[in-house]
Interface confidence: low
């Protein structure tokens, strides 16, 4: 059962796994949620009745029954992990803690004008987990305005003490605010030769990379595949670091793969969700339960529904045994990974999907696209919305994209002459405009946020956010698309599609069925040559065929230019403007979303 509220002056007795230090009970709950085994916790707040060495301790706990005896204790705050909950979870913590010194390894000291600047440095430094900043009121003159960047093995402070006139906080890498580059490539036949900070067992290099991404100290990894010559190292995932943040040496070795932590673009990749099945593979670990199941999919469901289950192995039924049901072994370990991986025994293994909610919803795989044709099918573009105006009569006005459960990203030029958000309606999960009737449910718009530098589409800043009056419940037919990562500026997108209900030619009408067209991106230099009378800025992105024929058109405005990269769809552009529609040597011009990620996050994450 999901319990979100904190229990004041209450301590859970027993079940201790480990003790960490956190600046608040709220953050202790987040740490517990992300820990592979923690189900409950007790935090000790600062209090005159409590020994100061126990202040800010966060004791992570586990229990077979999922609960523990409660004891009254002043200054203790207890609660449950969010693992038991179905709602979206985020590790992003923007809080600033006044008069607290979070202890760690001070590896970087510099002068900063403000705590915000210090936090930005921490966010953009590959090693930084948290920081402490001495304000200009700090008693010691030579330490004033000093920004200390810190890291620890666990990513949490080793101690927290009271210290007047300092402030502390965490890196905002998990808030998608880092400018660090993401190197997404996995390098085959490569070993990175640097310090190993940890090692785990993994079924493939992708899972190894995800483990590295959420491990606080891992900057890059090497994975030894099941064909690796040394048997004892097969399926071994080595988590690595270096002073420089990059591997010092690349060694050519067959049957090994290496890659990088994607911590700074983790909002647009699955990190916790290992959804694949591994055939003829057995995961070893502590056995939680053995239950009968009809299939490996059913076994995965059982594991996902058992809060303590981390991974499973399913052994199919021997002919006509047990009503055709196989054995489903539900398992766990201290770190969430199998203790050993064996091949050739006929088992089918996989991981719990319970942790998928710790990833951004936008990373969830959607149903495969229908290749060919121009009409879309239901659920193919679940982030696409149709924005209607009700004045003077109801009609489709523009497209838009779901980017959060209360947010639509669209184009600013759509709102020319729109006096009030009250006349707007957002319909999601729609394939055909004819589905929209009087009683069709819609989202009202609470607020229209237009970029304050917007003047006209052709001069840029053609971007707007709609804040919905109610939240979107994500389903297969309505879910968000990922924003591109700032660290991903060098990604070359090759699988890009424009969608909308707009005209199919310049003089036409709004289409009934959502249309799609695969369109290649065009360099800004090439695009500038085609639009000599305009300035194509880096905040714009162009797409189109040299010969024309496929393009966005009137009515598609505000809709997405969606590009698929590493199985995840990214909102690369917003349909903005162009000369005519699908004309030869006249590419469509789109708002370059990556250039507005900070603006989007500032507006959508504002308190």
């Amino acid at each position: 059962e999901c319990v979100t509220q904190l229990l004041k002056d209450t301590c859970f007795e027993g079940g201790d796994i480990t003790t960490v230090f956190t600046p608040s009970a709220k953050y202790c709950q987040v740490v517990c949620t992300y820990h592979p085994r923690c189900l409950l916790f007790t935090f000790t707040a600062e209090s005159p009745s409590e020994d100061p060495t126990r202040w800010f301790t966060c004791v992570l706990k586990d229990s077979v029954t999922e609960t523990l005896p409660r004891v009254n204790r002043t200054a203790a705050i207890s609660g449950y992990s969010f693992k038991q909950c179905s709602h979206q979870i985020s590790a992003c913590n923007k809080d600033i803690y006044v008069d607290l010194d979070m202890k760690g390894i001070n590896y970087n000291s510099s002068v900063a004008k403000s705590a915000q600047e210090c936090q930005e440095r921490c966010t953009d430094d590959v090693h930084c987990h948290f920081f402490t900043y001495a304000t200009r009121q700090f008693p010691s003159l030579e330490h004033r305005n000093i920004c200390l960047l810190k890291h620890t093995q666990t990513g949490t402070p080793t101690r927290i003490t009271k210290l007047d006139k300092v402030v502390s906080g965490f890196s905002l890498k998990s808030c998608a605010l880092s400018n660090l580059a993401c190197i997404r490539d996995i390098f085959p036949n490569t070993v990175f030769a640097d310090s190993n900070i940890d090692s785990v067992m993994a079924p493939d290099a992708f899972v190894c990379g995800r483990i590295c991404t959420h491990h606080p100290g891992c900057l890059f990894f090497t994975f030894f595949s099941q064909e690796w010559p040394k048997e004892s190292q097969r399926n071994l995932c080595l988590l690595k670091t270096s002073e420089s943040g990059l591997p010092s040496t690349r060694i050519k070795k067959s049957k090994a793969l290496s890659g990088f932590s994607l911590q700074s673009c983790r909002h647009s990749i699955p990190v916790f969700c290992h959804s694949s099945f591994y055939h003829d593979t057995d995961f070893l670990g502590e056995e939680l339960d053995i239950v009968a199941a009809k299939s490996h999919e059913a076994c995965q469901k059982l594991c996902t529904n058992a809060v303590r289950c981390q991974f499973f192995t399913y052994t199919p039924a021997q002919a006509s045994c047990n009503e055709g049901k196989g054995k489903c072994y539900l398992k766990l370990s201290s770190n969430g990974s199998p203790t050993k991986i064996l091949h050739g025994r006929g088992g089918i293994s996989g991981y719990t999907l319970r942790l998928c909610k710790m990833d951004n919803e936008c990373t969830t795989k959607i149903k495969p696209r229908i290749v060919g044709g121009t009409a879309s099918v239901r659920g193919e573009w679940p982030w696409q919305v149709t924005l209607h105006t009700t004045s003077p009569t109801q009609r489709h006005l523009c497209g838009g994209s779901i980017i959060g459960n209360q947010w639509i990203l669209t184009a600013a030029h759509c709102f020319y002459g729109v006096e009030s958000p009250k006349i707007l309606r957002v319909y999601s999960g729609i394939l055909n405009q004819s589905e929209i009737k009087e009683d069709t449910s819609f989202f009202g718009v609470q607020e229209i946020i237009i970029h304050d530098q917007y003047k006209m589409a052709e001069s840029g800043y053609d971007i707007a956010l709609l804040k919905l009056e109610t939240t979107v419940n994500y389903t297969d037919s309505q879910r968000p698309i990922c924003l591109p990562s700032k660290g991903d500026r060098n990604v070359i997108y090759t699988d890009c599609w424009v969608t909308g209900w707009g005209y199919r030619k310049l003089r036409d009408k709004i289409q009934n069925t959502l249309q799609k067209a695969k369109i290649p991106l065009v360099t800004n230099e090439e695009c500038q040559k085609r639009y000599r009378g305009h300035k194509i800025t880096h905040k714009m992105i162009c797409a189109g065929y040299r010969e024309g024929g496929k393009d966005a058109c009137k009515g598609d405005s505000g809709g997405p230019l969606s590009c698929k990269h590493n199985e995840v769809w990214h909102l690369v552009g917003i349909t903005s403007w162009g000369e005519g529609c699908a004309q030869r040597e006249r590419p469509g011009v789109y708002t370059n979303v990556v250039e507005y990620v900070d603006w989007i996050l500032e507006k959508t994450q504002a308190v």
């Epitope: 270096s242 002073e243 010092s248």
Partner: nanobody, 122 residues
Framework: QVQLVESGGGSVQAGGSLRLSCAAS????????MAWFRQAPGKGLEGVSL????????SYTDSVKGRFTISQDNSKNTLYLQMNSLKPEDTAVYYC???????????????WGQGTLVTVSS
């Protein structure tokens, strides 16, 4: 091991400019930070400017802000200190240092150059 060799020191009139260079060789990838320190006659070591080699973060001591510029050329493994509007109080032996910590403390730096003398006359 890392070897650091400074050059570019000399004598200059107040208000003049000099550019110091520090060529690094050896196990340079292990250096998280590089720094310029100086030691005036009869005084202790003073941090002048720091640069985080991987992230490019830069910091200056107050007395040189706006006059000195630290930079690096990774392709040549060289650290520079451009010194403009020099003052007599800038007279010192200037040392290049490399280490893993981005810190004003000389103790954080494992590798040091031999030093280059800068004399500023009024």
């Amino acid at each position: 091991q890392v070897q650091l060799v400074e050059s570019g020191g000399g004598s200059v009139q107040a208000g003049g400019s000099l550019r110091l260079s520090c060529a690094a060789s050896g196990y340079t990838y292990s250096m998280g930070a590089m720094a310029w320190f100086r030691q005036a006659p009869g005084k202790g070591l003073e941090g002048v400017s720091l640069i985080a080699t991987s992230s490019g973060f830069i910091s200056y001591t107050d007395s040189v802000k706006g006059r000195f510029t630290i930079s690096q050329d990774n392709s040549k493994n060289t650290l520079y200190l451009q010194m403009n509007s020099l003052k007599p109080e800038d007279t010192a032996v200037y040392y290049c240092a490399a280490g893993t910590q981005f810190s004003w403390s000389p103790g954080s730096y494992n590798y040091w150059g031999q030093g280059t003398l800068v004399t500023v006359s009024s």
